[in-house]
């Protein structure tokens, strides 16, 4: 005989759980034990079947979850699952908030990315850092040039995916070139975009010659400027 | 070509449920946020819900949330809209729209492609 | 929520001429990317809307010239340089800034 314990304690890292209203939201928490232990959920520490909210809630024993669609304002609290058997019992807390702000197209900090000169053999980090209300998902474009164009015949410009993420909101993301030679120079462009729209900044590398040894051992490895 | 085509239209009790889908063809459906947008008859134009690229983010009018449901299937090219509890006032014409994409906007960033429509009439 | 404003009500024009609609939203639509983001649409009788600008003042593929879009921050014009018979239609601004995504409430334009 066991008592019950976590079996994917990774997968309950996540504690707080920040959502927009209308989201569907998940708890999960597999567990196992000898006797199989049973699974049951309390909102702000009284049991909770989910009658007196509108669409109800989907409970699935087999995958130790408890499923709420269209989330409103009065779904926020410590939701909590409790896993017992004749052994013993374990839980779990989380908390959920619903966030009711009006979502909006990503935001990028002004200036960045920042327009940069290096000297070829050096490396380079372009940084954008973006705000959001829904998750955004992040690419990095290198503008190219086909057949001596920039430009294809509808006015846009010819562009290449360098690095695509989906990160959280408010971090900083990176694109690192490593050892730039002359061919990485030219524009660069952060394109963040979510639910509601996209939103792009660019910035031009420019990357020189391998400069005097003397004159390079007193100089930094690259130079941001704007 | 990029098409639109909404169904599941129909004449619905107050307090009864139905659900709309969009069928999307001539674009990659599962790279696009998307939209339901309804017009009431001889009315303007009001904003319903959004569902991100993956299906993983989702917004509601006020006047509809929690109550309706926006959802997704990829390997179907479908938008859905599950209408629960309808209301008189929930009786509109209801486009289904394609958002923002993923990847460089050449041209807008979505709001350029609608369906025809279908016609949702709830009443007693 | 952000409302969006539009006048006239009604437009009616004697084809050649030119017809101006205005659109004011209560907030400023101007993003930190530069760019603003109104749109225009016309709505053809019995149809779905029809993009014609998009962010401020760029013409959707296949829009006349004679369409053309301008205004800053809060206080957006559509015009029209010289109105034709299949113009007709109600025009809609809309804010593309932030959900909930809002529209103007229509100018019907009409032939004389």
């Known amino acids: 005989q066991q008592a019950p314990y976590w079996t994917h304690p990774q997968r309950m890292e996540k504690k707080l759980h920040a959502v927009p209203a209308g989201n569907t939201v998940k708890f999960r928490c597999p567990a196992a034990g000898n006797p199989t232990p049973t699974i049951r959920w309390l909102k702000d520490g009284q049991a909770f079947h989910g009658e007196n909210r509108i669409g109800g809630i989907r409970l699935r024993h087999q995958h130790w979850s408890l499923v709420m669609e269209s989330v409103v304002p009065s779904d926020r609290g410590t939701y909590t699952c409790l896993v017992e058997n004749a052994v013993g019992s374990i839980r779990y807390n989380y908390l959920l908030d619903v966030l009711e702000r009006s979502p909006h197209r990503p935001i990028l900090q002004a200036g960045l990315p920042a327009n940069t000169t290096a000297v070829v053999g050096s490396d380079v980090e372009l940084l954008c850092k973006v705000y959001s209300d829904a998750q955004p998902h992040i690419q990095w474009l290198k503008h190219i040039v086909i057949n001596g164009s920039s430009f294809g015949a509808d006015g846009f410009p010819y562009v290449q995916v360098l690095k695509t993420a989906d990160i959280n909101s408010s971090e900083v993301e990176v694109l690192y070139l490593r050892n730039v030679s002359a061919e990485d120079a030219g524009e660069y462009t952060c394109l963040a975009g979510n639910s509601i729209g996209l939103s792009y900044q660019s910035a031009w590398l420019t990357v020189l010659p391998e400069e005097d040894p003397t004159w390079t051992a007193a100089a930094p490895e690259a130079r941001y400027t704007d | 070509e990029v098409q639109l085509l909404e169904s599941g239209g129909g004449v619905v009790q107050p307090g009864r449920s139905l659900r709309l889908s969009c069928a999307a063809s001539g674009f990659t459906f599962s790279s696009y946020a998307m939209h339901w947008v309804r017009q009431a008859p001889g009315k303007g134009l009001e904003w319903v819900a959004v569902i991100s690229y993956d299906g993983s983010n989702k917004y509601y009018a006020d006047s509809v949330k929690g109550r309706f449901t926006i959802s997704r299937d990829n390997s179907k090219n479908t938008l859905s809209l599950q209408m629960n509890s309808l209301r008189v006032e929930d009786t509109a014409i209801y486009y289904c729209v394609r958002g923002a994409g993923l990847g460089f906007p050449y041209g807008p960033d979505g709001f350029d492609i609608w369906g025809q429509g279908t016609m949702v009439t709830v009443s007693s | 929520d952000i409302v969006m404003t539009q006048t006239p009500l009604s437009l009616s024009v004697t084809p050649g001429q030119p017809a101006s609609i205005s659109c004011t939203s209560s907030r400023s639509l101007l993003h930190s990317d530069g760019k603003t983001y109104v749109y225009w649409y016309v709505q053809k009788s019995g149809q779905p809307p029809q993009l014609l600008i998009y962010?401020?003042?760029n013409r959707f593929s296949g829009v006349p010239d004679r369409f053309s879009g301008s205004g800053s921050r809060t206080d957006f014009t559509l015009k029209i340089s010289r109105v034709e018979a299949e113009d007709v239609g109600v025009y809609y601004c809309?804010?593309?800034?932030?959900?909930?995504?809002?529209f103007g409430g229509g100018t019907k334009v009409e032939i004389k």
């Open positions: 809309m804010q593309y800034i932030e959900a909930p995504l809002t």
């Open positions: 962010e401020l003042s």
